[in-house]
Interface confidence: low
Amino acid sequence: IPVIEPSVPELVVKPGATVTLRCVGNGSVEWDGPPSPHWTLYSDGSSSILSTNNATFQNTGTYRCTEPGDPLGGSAAIHLYVKDPARPWNVLAQEVVVFEDQDALLPCLLTDPVLEAGVSLVRVRGRPLMRHTNYSFSPWHGFTIHRAKFIQSQDYQCSALMGGRKVMSISIRLKVQKVIPGPPALTLVPAELVRIRGEAAQIVCSASSVDVNFDVFLQHNNTKLAIPQQSDFHNNRYQKVLTLNLDQVDFQHAGNYSCVASNVQGKHSTSMFFRVVESAYLNLSSEQNLIQEVTVGEGLNLKVMVEAYPGLQGFNWTYLGPFSDHQPEPKLANATTKDTYRHTFTLSLPRLKPSEAGRYSFLARNPGGWRALTFELTLRYPPEVSVIWTFINGSGTLLCAASGYPQPNVTWLQCSGHTDRCDEAQVLQVWDDPYPEVLSQEPFHKVTVQSLLTVETLEHNQTYECRAHNSVGSGSWAFIPISAGAHTHPPDEFLFTP
């Protein structure tokens, strides 16, 4: 880091004095300070001398010495006050330009540090600062207006109390420029519009910018529309509004409308589509299959998309049977609006019970009439199995009834010993029944099938098992003969109802 001699942070001298500032570094060094007259510069290798033999108030300022070759970019500084009783202020610039919300430094430097206690900032001709002007003072740098606003673009003076009276600096003009981040901000409402032929419509195109210099126009299918413009200024922004009012729309009014605004930064445009229809419409659709299959106990969300104009006057979900008389709970129905003319309606069916299978209809109404979309919900069940022993045409028969959805497949197993379920080691014989007889197959109900296994003699120390399975699961029933030769006693009466 370079070193300055004299090695003090600030130096106070009188006008006309000789001042010598010497900077020494490891390599070559450079001085940087306020532009002022009467300085001479002498450099000798790793040192540089800045000197004047006639200091004036204009030499007041901070002088910084840097070592360009230093990778750490170190520097040293000294502040020089040239204490002029007639001139308390050294103004380094008479015009300051900043963008809105930046800090604006008004560079009036105090020539005498003793005066710091009585300084203030005023507007020219003694006018007070605008309300909410937030500022601070540094004797080395001047007044800083923090987060300057466009409205603070004024002429300012720095004031110091000298001998009981206020002494003003020359004026400094502050120009606070609006930050034009880009082209004007645009709104075009509505974002989408549908009207029935003969109805009224309104399209509003508005643009706003921090700067008044911008243009805005509305065009229909690439044709610029001649619409009177309303102008306004609020929230520190200029607004220009174009309103297209159509008393009775017709098909030629339909099409693409673009709102276009431009300024020096460029052009912005936004579009909307206006649809003119002959009559009210109401369309229901679903991305889901209208035929749904769900395992009992699981949940399902039924979703319907609605496109409608005019808006819906009513909608609801209805259970159409065939089981209980229950209706979907309103709290399970949910509606979300995608935009003005499109909505999504969801019916949540958690933990489905057997009585909840059947048809669910979503019903919507608008002035165009009623529409309905019906879902068919079938529940899947794992098979339930039962086996009985009976006689059919004099032959001993094991009769297995399996009920589930989808339709269960049936397999018979014969295994040694008495067991609840045949394992591989015990199996003596396996019969697949590819075509069990379907006993009942009603929509939304379980399918019940029946499989017969003719057994001439029931083996006493054996188990006969009927297994059924479908895509949901499996079920089985083990039949253990009570005594050998049971086949010889056909029942007096046989009635089997699955």
Partner: antibody, heavy 118, light 107 residues
């Protein structure tokens, strides 16, 4: 089970007003999605929708007969009433009421024949 | 109002025949179409709704198809009890309207 029965005069004179009552059971007209329609059929001719009332008490009428028709309901009595003014011999027809669900007339009354004659 | 037309207006057929009746709407009605059967002196009976869905209890020999403006009712194997007049009805927009009917009688 669902039943509907039409009642009203069998004979009306020209220019008179016809009042028909549909009494139903097995469903409620306060259930959403439920409607009752009146449909008529002149002898040997096609069916014609006259009017429909829904659970929300919204009413829909035949375009050509709109000015002559009024439909109303009494949910507590399970009744729907149709009145038709300024009767003419061409209005001679069998008048049916039907339960209409989601726009579909799934249950019908047996119909009542109304003759318009002086 | 939407106008419904049916063809033919009447025809003769024998039991066992395959019978096709067509119905046309004056504008698109999606699948909002029902078919009814009416026998003399009786009220109409709902056969098919949503263009192709069979009403419960209706024999499977009846079937419906179509969407938009053109629809068909088919009786795959005509039975003696099927001799009647058949009406189509749109329920796409109010007022709901019926076709003029197609009478199927014994040849």
């Amino acid at each position: 089970q669902v039943t509907l029965r039409e009642s009203g005069p069998a004979l009306v004179k020209p220019t008179q007003t016809l009042t028909l009552t549909c009494t139903f059971s097995g469903f409620s007209l306060s259930t959403s999605g439920m409607c009752v329609s009146w449909i008529r059929q002149p002898p040997g001719k096609a069916l014609e929708c006259l009017a429909l009332i829904d659970w929300d008490d919204d009413k829909y009428y035949s375009t050509s007969l709109k000015t002559r028709l009024t439909i109303s309901k009494d949910t507590s009595k399970n009744q729907v009433v149709l009145t038709m003014t300024n009767m003419d011999p061409v209005d001679t027809a069998t008048y049916y009421c039907a339960r209409t669900q989601l726009g579909i007339a799934d249950y019908w009354g047996q119909g009542t024949l109304v003759t318009v004659s002086s | 109002a939407i106008r419904m037309t049916q063809s033919p207006s009447s025809f003769s057929a024998s039991t066992g025949d395959r019978v096709t009746i067509t119905c046309r709407a004056s504008q698109g009605i999606s699948s909002y179409l029902a078919w009814y059967q009416q026998k003399p002196g009786k009220a109409p009976k709902l056969l098919i709704y949503a263009a192709s869905t069979l009403q419960s209890g209706v024999p499977s020999r009846f079937s419906g198809s179509g969407s938009g403006t053109d629809f068909t009712l088919t009786i795959s194997c005509l039975q003696s009890e099927d001799f009647a007049t058949y009406y189509c009805q749109q329920y796409y927009s109010y007022p709901f309207t019926f076709g003029p009917g197609t009478k199927v009688d014994i040849k």
